[in-house]
């Protein structure tokens, strides 16, 4: 069952799933000037059995200008550098992940992918929040949100996190600093 809404927005925070439950869908989005190949699915789907989960369908982008061709356009040097950084971050994140049964890991980037990833989450999915760089986390409880089914309706639990500017006085004295900066998080998961 898909979650009706997107996870809650927390000012100056981003959210991220460590792993994606089976049934999760990811839009195949291409950056400006590119589009999905004609036969391509609009989504990738996290699917699997009891022992192994993986993403079904592969997203592929082709130049909008090219007619009836799936030829990939080589990224410009700065794009390549950007992508390499993103890939490294993704790999580092994956290395830290424990394989959860019935879950898929973050799909690797595809060529000419849009900067924003759009997920359609399913009931039972947990996402974790982090303050953006320059803001400090004040926790009242877990900085996570879970999509739950209640009385036939889906809802996300409210994450207990406030992000305050470094210069602002702390509302909760003695709070720990956030452990990591969220540079590796996709743009789509940013709450403004």
């Amino acid at each position: 069952e898909l979650c009706d809404d997107d996870p809650p927005k927390i000012t100056h925070a981003t959210f991220k799933a460590v792993a994606y439950k089976e049934g999760t869908m990811l839009n195949c989005e291409c950056k400006r000037g590119f589009r999905r190949i004609k036969s391509g699915s609009p989504y990738m789907l996290c699917t699997g059995n009891s022992s192994h989960s993986s993403w079904d369908n592969q997203c592929q982008c082709t130049s909008s200008a090219a007619r009836n061709t799936t030829k990939q356009v080589t990224p410009q040097p700065e794009e390549q550098k950007e992508r390499k950084t993103t890939e490294m971050q993704s790999q580092m994140q994956l290395a830290d992940q424990v394989s959860l049964p019935g879950h898929c890991r973050e799909p690797p980037p595809w060529e000419n992918e849009a900067t924003e990833r759009i997920y359609h989450f399913v009931v039972g999915q947990t996402v974790y929040y982090q303050c953006v760089q320059g803001y400090r986390a004040l926790h009242r409880g877990p900085a996570e949100s879970v999509c739950k089914m209640t009385h036939g309706k889906t809802r996300w639990t409210q994450p207990q996190l406030i992000c305050t500017g470094e210069t602002e006085p702390s509302q909760f004295p003695g709070e720990e600093e956030p452990q990591a900066s969220p540079d590796g998080l996709p743009e789509s998961e940013t709450s403004r």
């Epitope: 869908m25 839009n27 195949c28 989005e29 989504y43």
Partner: nanobody, 126 residues
Framework: QVQLVESGGGLVQAGGSLRLSCAAS????????MGWFRQAPGKEREFVAA????????RYGDSVKGRFTISRGNAKNTVFLQMNSLKPEDTAVYYC???????????????????WGQGTQVTVSS
């Protein structure tokens, strides 16, 4: 040339129903998502509902869940918005929109739709 034409708007009493239609032509891609948005005077454009052609994903805005239903016509390029239990706060101009790719829903989604219709007025009187 892409065209989205809405119809079915009008004046209805609270508790009543309306069915909006959107006919698309000239869309240059195979798999696309179609959505409905609305805009009341002095308010931001609000996401109402969206679905892809195959009906893989259907999403609704919070305020219309359980009352509105988005569906596809027999013709691949037509979508309907069945609006039941209408309330005065549903009064707005309703716009049909289309985008290349999967469904995008939620508060920031209108920027993700490439093509827009002219809109049809829905007025719900109390």
């Amino acid at each position: 040339q892409v065209q989205l034409v809405e119809s079915g708007g009008g004046l209805v009493q609270a508790g009543g129903s309306l069915r909006l239609s959107c006919a698309a032509s000239g869309i240059p891609f195979d798999n696309y998502a179609m959505g409905w948005f609305r805009q009341a005077p002095g308010k931001e454009r609000e996401f109402v509902a969206a679905r892809d052609l195959e009906g893989i994903i259907t999403r609704y805005g919070d305020s219309v869940k359980g009352r509105f239903t988005i569906s596809r016509g027999n013709a691949k390029n037509t979508v309907f918005l069945q609006m039941n239990s209408l309330k005065p706060e549903d009064t707005a101009v309703y716009y049909c929109a289309a985008r290349d790719g999967g469904v995008v829903a939620g508060s920031r989604s209108s920027a993700q739709y490439n093509y827009w219709g002219q809109g049809t007025q829905v007025t719900v009187s109390s």
